[in-house]
Amino acid sequence: SPVPPSTALKELIEELVNITQNQKAPLCNGSMVWSINLTAGVYCAALESLINVSGCSAIEKTQRMLNGFCPHKVSAGQFSSLRVRDTKIEVAQFVKDLLVHLKKLFREGQFN
């Protein structure tokens, strides 16, 4: 049976918490990704940004989980209007910002 949206969001948050807590060396060797506007469509935008990071096992589960939240197919190189123009940040900072935002969504009961 499908996982309730609140459970799915909680599991995604748990995964991001694990990543931030277990981070020893620079996450994904310090790879840079496009910063996004943390507004509507955050899951697809986050996936569109993170999908361009390859060979980083630490975020593979996050990529798969985000894929479950995003209703359309996302492929590398694709980018929506939610990208912050010409701004790149380290994956570690991206994950931290995303985590803060998702925790707020959970606190506010916004699961979809």
């Epitope: 609140s6 909680k10 948050i13 748990e14 918490v17 931030t20 807590q21 943390l38 507004t39 985590l99 803060v100 935002h101 925790k103 707020k104 959970f106 606190r107 009961g109 699961f111």
Partner: antibody
Framework: QVQLVQSGAEVKKPGSSVKVSCKAS????????MHWVRQAPGQGLEWMGT????????KYVPKFQGRVTITADESTSTAYMELSSLRSEDTAVYYC??????????????????WGQGTLVTVSS | DVLMTQSPSSLSASVGDRVTITCRSS???????????LEWYQQKPGKAPKLLIY???DRFSGVPSRFSGSGSGTDFTLTISSLQPEDFATYYC?????????FGQGTKLEIK
């Protein structure tokens, strides 16, 4: 260290407006919710509303809707509470407070873990 | 609005006593995300309130272990196992589950 420093005491005439500021340091306000709570002399605490400084979204107590405006300026790490059409029963100490996520738990947003020192607003003709 | 009713409104006790303050909500305060955002605050005259307990029973960092919270649904309790001189203050329960968030009317704890 975490600090919330509020603006000084104000004396206002009925019908006027007051704007109280709350300067944050030691954390990023965009990671938090910022709240405003008031306490009339000898009375209990009353939650007025909150803002998410990351996007400007606000929630207000219906009783204050239309009279209160909560804003935040991320660039100066300052939250503001403006109350208009003041009446004598608005005489109170106004507190700002923050709630922030806990790195070590999945979903904990503390209700209000750090508070400003309070700002006394006196409404008198 | 959710009405939070504390009892008693005032209480006289001695150092070393075990004290229980109760808080009843006018409706169930389980949030849509499954958490119950019930907190307890302590306030001393002329000072800002201090967070003691969040999510019914989680003690905030630095709060002595003599403070504990319990309850579920609509009935909640704050217990001070052995009163210390610095514990004489006013205590407020608070619900952050349903907007508008609301405080109880307070319980003033005085020295007998």
């Amino acid at each position: 260290q975490v600090q919330l420093v509020q603006s000084g005491a104000e004396v206002k005439k009925p019908g006027s407006s007051v704007k109280v500021s709350c300067k944050a340091s030691g954390f990023y306000i965009k990671d938090t919710y910022m709240h405003w709570v008031r306490q009339a002399p000898g009375q209990g605490l009353e939650w007025m509303g909150t803002i998410d400084p990351a996007n400007g979204n606000t929630k207000y107590v219906p009783k204050f809707q239309g009279r209160v405006t909560i804003t935040a300026d991320e660039s100066t790490s300052t939250a503001y509470m403006e109350l208009s059409s003041l009446r004598s029963e608005d005489t109170a100490v106004y507190y700002c407070a923050r709630s922030i996520y806990d790195d070590y738990h999945v979903d904990d947003y503390y209700a209000m873990d750090y508070w400003g020192q309070g700002t006394l607003v006196t409404v008198s003709s | 609005d959710v009405l939070m009713t504390q009892s008693p409104s005032s209480l006289s006790a001695s150092v070393g006593d075990r004290v229980t303050i109760t808080c009843r909500s006018s409706q169930n305060i389980v949030h849509i995300n499954g958490n119950t955002y019930l907190e307890w605050y302590q306030q001393k005259p002329g000072k800002a309130p201090k967070l003691l307990i969040y999510k019914i029973s989680d003690r905030f960092s630095g709060v002595p272990s003599r403070f504990s919270g319990s309850g579920s649904g609509t009935d909640f309790t704050l217990t001070i196992s052995s009163l210390q001189p610095e514990d004489f203050a006013t205590y407020y329960c608070f619900q952050g589950s349903h907007v508008p968030w609301t405080f109880g009317q307070g319980t003033k704890l005085e020295i007998k």
